[in-house]
């Protein structure tokens, strides 16, 4: 889910009746993004 | 390799309880969204719960269908989010996933009946 | 809540040949950013759901160019441009920018 989306989160917004997360933000919180921005700490040895 | 594994599903009868784990590995964990779907057996597919990562303070979000009788957690030293499902109704009866929406488990099945 | 309305249901195809799938949204996807936040997940005979297309035309990935996502804010189309055998599942479409996230009921394709 790569793509050059900054990462930010500036909380919930809220309409009439229901609450919407900002801007689609599950891009930058996603497994595929974790994967390409941080090294796991303590990779399995083989 | 990216893993989800779910575990913790069986048989239940309505008004028990039962608690799902899935545990993770595989990709950095500590800022990753993660959410548990269920596929019912008319294979409807209904998202249930959503818990975000410490920064965001673990804000947690449910489907009206399931607030006040399902609880999302996760345990960041151990790679691993909880779905506490008390009160369970037949309507609850399914495979429950867990996603970061990219990748998904293999699901689990919960079946509540009398 | 929004509503995701696929049509068709179920869809036959003939290996070779292309398939479109329509999801319309009772509600603009589109956010202030640009983002369409519409989405494209199969889910094939006792597997899973994976993604295949995330923000209405990203191709997921490990996701052939067979597969593409088009639409406006509130009108989606998923495209195979020749199908495969490997194909046959149930295609849903997904909102995640409002609560409680939606899905579409389902398109069941499969092959003539």
């Known amino acids: 889910l790569a793509d050059p989306l900054d990462h930010r989160d500036a909380g919930d917004l809220w309409f009439p009746g229901e609450s919407e997360s900002f801007e689609d933000a599950h891009v930058e919180h996603s497994i595929s993004r974790s994967l390409l921005e941080g090294e796991i700490p303590f990779p399995p040895t083989s | 390799e990216v893993q989800l594994v779910e575990t913790g599903g069986s048989l239940v009868q309505p008004g028990g309880s039962l608690k799902l784990t899935c545990a993770t590995s595989?990709?950095?964990?500590?800022?990753?969204?993660l959410h548990w779907i269920r596929r019912s057996p008319e294979k409807q597919l209904e998202w249930v719960a959503q818990?975000?990562?410490?920064?965001?303070?673990?804000?947690?979000y449910y489907a009206e269908s399931v607030k006040g009788r399902f609880i999302v957690s996760r345990d960041d030293s151990k790679t691993t989010i909880y779905l506490q499902m008390n009160n369970l109704k037949e309507e609850d009866t399914a495979i429950y996933y867990c996603?970061?929406?990219?990748?998904w488990g293999q699901g689990v099945m919960v079946t509540v009946s009398s | 809540d929004v509503v995701l309305t696929q049509a068709p249901l179920s869809v036959s195809v003939t290996p070779g040949e292309s398939a479109s799938i329509s999801c319309r949204s009772s509600?603009?996807?589109?956010?202030?950013?640009?983002?369409?936040?519409l989405y494209w997940y199969l889910q094939k005979p006792g597997m899973s759901p994976h993604l295949l297309i995330y923000?209405?035309?990203n191709l997921a990935s490990g996701i052939p160019d067979r597969f593409s996502g088009s639409g406006s804010e509130t009108d989606f189309t998923l495209k195979i441009s020749e199908v495969e055998p490997e194909d046959v599942g149930v295609y849903y479409c997904?909102?995640?920018?409002?609560?409680?996230?939606?899905f579409g009921a389902g398109t069941k394709l499969e092959l003539k």
């Open positions: 997904a909102q995640f920018l409002v609560y409680p996230y939606t």
């Open positions: 923000r209405m035309s």
């Open positions: 509600r603009s996807l589109l956010t202030s950013k640009g983002i369409t936040s």
């Open positions: 996603t970061g929406l990219d990748y």
């Open positions: 595989g990709f950095p964990f500590s800022n990753v969204w």
């Open positions: 818990i975000k990562a410490r920064s965001d303070n673990y804000a947690t």
